[in-house]
């Protein structure tokens, strides 16, 4: 019969014949022959392969370097790599999470719109009219200005995006 020119899924073509790929978590030791099946071996400790493959070497698990602010989020297996994340208060500098930086704080006049996660930084928003923030914070949203009228007081000093309204007593008309 004609030698194959293409193989089925989970097979690879070598020496004019189709051999089985090694399953995830295993590496190739020897190709199949006319008489023998593909020979595979499990990856060693701290190694992985995450696809059907014909690799002769497994990949090394990622190291979550504490000196770079990293910690293990999920331990690697023979089929998956280790997933790193950042220590509390830090976030990854890239999708691959190879290093971490400190979460940004929102300055006075800005509030937190979205708190930082292990993979994204704090998102700040300018305090809109009627709101203020007088602190630098990675958690606090803008606060609404105090409503003087609900306390039977009047506005003595207008609020800004950084300061609250100052309320004071209503001027009493003298008789």
């Amino acid at each position: 019969p004609e030698p194959p020119t293409a193989c089925r899924e989970k097979q690879y073509l070598i020496n004019s014949q189709c051999c089985s790929l090694c399953q995830p978590g295993q590496k190739l030791v020897s190709d199949c022959t006319e008489f023998t099946e593909t020979e595979c071996l499990p990856c060693g400790e701290s190694e992985f392969l995450d696809t059907w493959n014909r690799e002769t070497h497994c990949h090394q698990h990622k190291y979550c370097d504490p000196n770079l602010g990293l910690r293990v989020q999920q331990k690697g297996t023979s089929e998956t790599d280790t997933i790193c994340t950042c220590e509390e208060g830090w976030h990854c500098t890239s999708e691959a999470c190879e290093s971490c930086v400190l979460h940004r704080s929102c300055s006075p006049g800005f509030g937190v719109k979205q708190i930082a996660t292990g993979v994204s930084d704090t998102i700040c928003e300018p305090c809109p009219v009627g709101f203020f923030s007088n602190v630098s914070s990675a958690f606090e949203k803008c606060h609404p200005w105090t409503s003087c009228e609900t306390k039977d007081l009047v506005v003595q000093q207008a609020g800004t995006n950084k300061t609250d309204v100052v309320c004071g007593p209503q001027d009493r008309l003298r008789a």
Epitope: I115, T117, I123, C142, S147
Partner: antibody, heavy 118, light 110 residues
Framework: CQSVEESGGRLVTPGTPLTLNCTVS????????MNWVRQAPGKGLEWIGV?????EIFYASWAKGRFTISKTSTTVDLKITSPSTEDTATYFC??????????????WGPGTLVTVSS | AYDMTQTPASVEVAVGGTVTIKCQAS??????LAWYLQKPGQPPKLLIY???KLASGVSSRFEGSGSGTQFTLTISGVQCDDAATYYC????????????FGGGTEVVVK
Amino acid sequence: CQSVEESGGRLVTPGTPLTLNCTVSGFSLSSYDMNWVRQAPGKGLEWIGVIWNNGEIFYASWAKGRFTISKTSTTVDLKITSPSTEDTATYFCAGDADGGVVSYFHVWGPGTLVTVSS
Amino acid sequence: AYDMTQTPASVEVAVGGTVTIKCQASQTIYTYLAWYLQKPGQPPKLLIYEASKLASGVSSRFEGSGSGTQFTLTISGVQCDDAATYYCQQGYNSRHVDNVFGGGTEVVVK
């Protein structure tokens, strides 16, 4: 596609605590503020409270002590601490997509019915 | 504490007509107001936010206006499908409130 769905509504006897769940998909609770709103049969909308994306919780003045809001990474829960017959209503979970300090309810669940009766 | 009063409670309007719903806040909420419509058995749907901005996919027959404490929703060229209950909602303050919603206005289309 962003969606929320409430569950846990059922018939309970007065005084029996009940927890409702709101499961979100298509968005993260670290960016959305989540509100609980209820509607008694034939009545208007009544806001119960909100859990902000930063974890802060605020309740309507009438709801303090009667309800507890909490969240995990994908669900927002509402505990009715000691239901009475006046708590019979459809309970909605509603999400505010912006995450800023001004709250509008962009995403609503279909609601879950709670009936309190002896 | 930021009470929202809606008027009228119910209004009847002919197809093609115009209906106006008012919402009053007990103290200033600037322009932080939204309008919703709700049909029986369904959750509310956001129509307008920031007092006058149309939510995605909402017909331009719906128009919101106002600021401070006085707000209006106007529906022009009313259609049968507009029959629903409409609610206003203050988006300004979650901290000291009884209810962020107005009492609702039922629109009946003749």
